[in-house]
């Protein structure tokens, strides 16, 4: 309706004497801003005066004066949308209707709000879920239709008068829609909480009691049971009687059915609170409990372990493990049903009693072949001795024993011979099925356990065989001791380590990798000439003339072997330098003269330097110095210097004579 002012606020607000009331409020005027506001208590419209009568709790005046009452009542709104009010403290006689008289420049409006103030604090209200079951989490809610900024309060939860440990979540609402304080408590009730009193207590800021609400918990739970047994230790002998009684300590709702279970399985036709077992047998040993159900579900008692005692039954032997490997450990277990458990055991190996073995288990840490055979046992408890059952067979397996490799040939063996070997052993379990040989080669095995090596190599030093069943047993290697001529003969320079320079002390070594027999002789040769018969060839001061191709020979009683030819290279500084002149040392002016620096050097000369009779270097660095046309002034002594990576050498002086030509002489 466009002719109405629009207000939003809670319809009714609740408080108590001495507290306060906070009224959240919004509005929209028909036109323009608010010019006048009066808060009435129980306003009545006077038709005669066309005005409202009633107690004025608050009035906004144009001169700005505030009546004393306005200290208690505050208008917290504004001129266009907020009309929030606060009354602090609030009194019992404030109950009733509050009238908000609003006037704009052209329009007027009276808005009514209900205020309910009680004499003392009213109680909160506890809300419970429709059904509570044990161990299922529920939320308890405590709601109070009150909240005010000027009057802090708290809600506390109690169980049977004792504060609850669980943390509660408190929330407040002060909105135009609702005003309340709420506390929510999450709680997992147990069956023992059934019938207990829960209280929500309203307290002021100092924790002083103001009011409360209480509820009694109705916790649905399965029946809670206790079981009693006669005899109390539940240990009997075959033929005795046993009585078990089931008592219900709590059930909500009431129980409906009763049953008994043995080892988790229901016993037929046992639907009373007492279970009588007459003349029990050993099969009736087990775990018993009673089960009582209600609408929530079944409840079970604790289990009673009924033990029916009897003498040991015929025993069996379990072997861990058979067949057993020699050297491994084996455990024998005597298995015999008995109650109480057997206290003594007697063990037999191949029918003969094993002394000192009285335990349920026999442990042999290291099995040997003689441990094989049949094992049996007898068990004994306080009620008697059992019978010896069928025995268990232990099979002890072991690798082949005392394996040897035998050479069938006459000794010594020479490189290239045919060699036959056999592989022998003493005993084996299981039987030998194959043989292996080390090292592996492309060799013949003419029959099982025999090896034939055609054209035996110089390096066939040792051979070993293995006889194999599930395992291989290796014989000690046998030395073939193959005899051969010296091998891998080579010349090795041992001094100097780097390149050989003229004047160095040089040692060459005649190396070979192996020889059998070891006794050897050496021979050195250069260009077919015998030089020495030692393993080393030494030069105290090597000269360029010692360069050349060297070989060494090593021989033993089987044969002789030569090295590859080894080239000895001697590095030396330029030597034997001389200046040669072409066409000769006397040349006519105007012709061409070529001076050549001749030298002997290793490595070759890298560059030359030419000098004149004044020791002045000439700007020429090649081997030849060409003077063209030659002049009389070129006459004189020349010398050259050659340089390589080893060093330097220089020539003696050579004199060039340049004589005048007939033309020059004619002109004079």
């Amino acid at each position: 309706d466009s002719s109405k002012w629009v207000f939003e606020h809670p319809e009714t607000l609740y408080a108590w004497e001495g507290a306060c009331v906070w009224i959240p409020c919004t509005y929209r005027a028909l036109d323009g801003d608010l010019e006048s506001f009066i808060l009435f208590h129980n306003p009545e419209y006077n038709k005669n005066t066309s005005k409202f009568d009633g107690t004025r709790l608050y009035e906004s005046t144009k001169d700005g004066k505030v009546p004393s009452e306005q200290k208690r009542v505050q208008f917290l709104g504004d001129k266009n949308k907020n009309c929030t009010l606060s009354i602090h403290p609030v009194h019992l006689n404030d109950s009733g209707q509050l009238g908000l008289r609003m006037e704009s420049k052209t329009e007027k409006w009276m808005e009514r709000i209900h205020l309910n103030v009680s004499e003392r604090p009213f109680p909160p209200h506890i809300q419970l879920p429709p059904e509570i079951q044990e161990s299922q989490e529920v939320t308890l809610t405590c709601l109070l239709n009150f909240s005010c900024y000027g009057y802090p309060i708290q809600l506390q939860w109690l169980l049977e008068g004792v504060p609850m440990r669980q943390a509660a979540v408190t929330s407040t609402s002060l909105t135009i829609k609702s005003v309340f304080t709420r506390s929510e408590l999450k709680f997992s009730p147990q069956w023992s909480h059934h019938g207990k009193i829960v209280t929500c207590q309203l307290q002021d800021a100092d924790g002083k009691f103001l009011s409360n609400d209480t509820v009694q918990l109705n916790v649905k739970h399965t029946p809670k049971l206790e079981i009693k047994v006669t005899p109390s230790d539940a240990i009997v002998r075959e033929g005795d009687s046993v009585t078990m009684t089931c008592e219900v300590s709590s059930s909500n709702p009431e129980y409906t059915t009763v049953s008994w279970l043995k080892d988790g399985t229901s016993l037929k036709k046992q639907n009373t609170f007492t279970l009588n077992l007459r003349e029990v047998t050993k099969d009736q040993s087990g775990k018993y409990c009673c089960q009582v159900s209600n609408d929530v579900g079944p409840g079970r008692s604790e289990e009673v372990f009924l033990q029916v005692q009897y003498a040991p039954e015929p025993s069996t032997v379990q072997i861990l493990h058979s067949p057993a490997v020699e050297g491994s450990q084996v455990e024998f277990l005597c298995m015999s049903l008995a109650n109480p458990l057997p206290t003594n055991y007697t063990w037999y190996h191949n029918g003969k009693e094993m002394q000192g073995r009285t335990e349920e288990k026999v442990h042999i840490p290291k099995i040997l072949p003689w441990h094989a055979g049949t094992y049996s046992c007898v068990a004994e408890n306080i009620l008697g001795t059992g019978q010896r059952g069928p025995g268990a067979e232990l099979d002890v397996q072991y690798p082949p024993k005392k394996v040897t490799t035998v050479i069938q040939n006459p000794m010594p063996i020479r490189e290239g011979d045919t060699v036959t070997l056999s592989c022998n052993y003493n005993s084996s379990n299981p039987s030998v099925t194959r043989y292996e040989w080390k090292p592996h080669g492309a060799w013949e095995e003419p029959s099982l356990g025999v090896l034939k090596i055609q054209n035996v190599g110089w390096d066939n030093t040792t051979i070993a065989c293995a006889a194999c069943n599930s395992w291989c047993s290796w014989a000690s290697p046998v030395a073939l001791n193959v005899q051969y001529a010296p091998r891998d003969v080579r010349v090795r320079k041992i001094k100097p380590l780097s390149e050989i320079h003229s004047g160095n002390s040089v040692s060459l070594q005649c190396d070979f990798s192996s020889s059998h027999p070891k006794e050897v002789q050496f021979f050195w040769e250069k260009n077919g000439r015998l030089l020495g018969k030692e393993s080393q060839l030494n030069f105290d001061s090597i000269s360029p003339e010692d360069a050349g191709s060297y070989s060494c020979w090593v021989n033993n009683s089987i044969g002789q072997t030569a090295s590859k030819a080894w080239t000895l290279e001697v590095l030396y500084a330029p030597r034997r330098l001389r200046v040669s002149m072409s066409p000769g040392d006397q040349v006519m002016e105007g012709k061409s003269a070529t001076l050549t620096c001749e030298s002997d050097a290793n490595p070759p000369v890298s560059h030359y330097t030419w000098f004149d009779w004044n020791n002045q270097s000439l700007p020429y660095h090649s081997q030849k110095l060409r003077l063209e046309p030659v002049k009389v002034q070129h006459s004189g002594a020349y010398w050259c210097q050659g340089t390589n990576s080893v060093g330097k050498g220089r020539s003696p002086l050579s004199t060039l004579t340049v004589y005048y030509s007939p033309e020059t002489i004619g002109r004079r």
Partner: antibody
Amino acid sequence: QVQLQQSGPGLVKHSQTLSLTCAISGDSVSSNSAAWNWIRQSPSRGLEWLGRTYYRSKWYNDYAVSVKSRITINPDTSKNQFSLQLNSVTPEDTAVYYCAQEVEPHDAFDIWGQGTMVTVSS
Amino acid sequence: DIQMTQSPSSVYASVGDKVTITCRASQDVSGWLAWYQQKPGLAPQLLISGASTLQGEVPSRFSGSGSGTDFTLTISSLQPEDFATYYCQQAKYFPYTFGQGTKLEIK
């Protein structure tokens, strides 16, 4: 009158590179009758020739075997100088380093630089 | 490498004395031998090259002789400025090598 002026750091860290320069005045690094050398002196090894560079139609180098794998001597014709680089130095390389001119035909060191004391710190 | 051995390692003499220092090469170095003088904190200074050629500004009291493997440096009449360390050096083979030095000290 030929003069040689050395420059470069006096302290080098272990395993780093020693670099020195020798500036020539009064002659050319490309001279056809001179060679340019580096020599060092230490109490333990005395005077030790390290190597040389020289020009005879092309550039040549000769190095001492003891440092051959670590040494480089380079001429710089644009600045008329030559340099020494010695890699992977150790405290054993601590010495006074000299540059020197060698002149044919006697091939002796007639002009020396002022010397640079180089310490290798570990 | 060519070994250069100087003897003696040190020599004590007075002003006006004649002093002889010898240098032996482990191999023939022809005439490629030089002699140097070094004073503390300074670079060596060339005295003689080619075994016997005196450098331009070196006083005539210094002389050198020898060829092949054995060489000699002679100072005919010692002057106060001659007290220093003297080194020989071969220049025939690479690497060039120096003697260990002879220290000339005032008696």
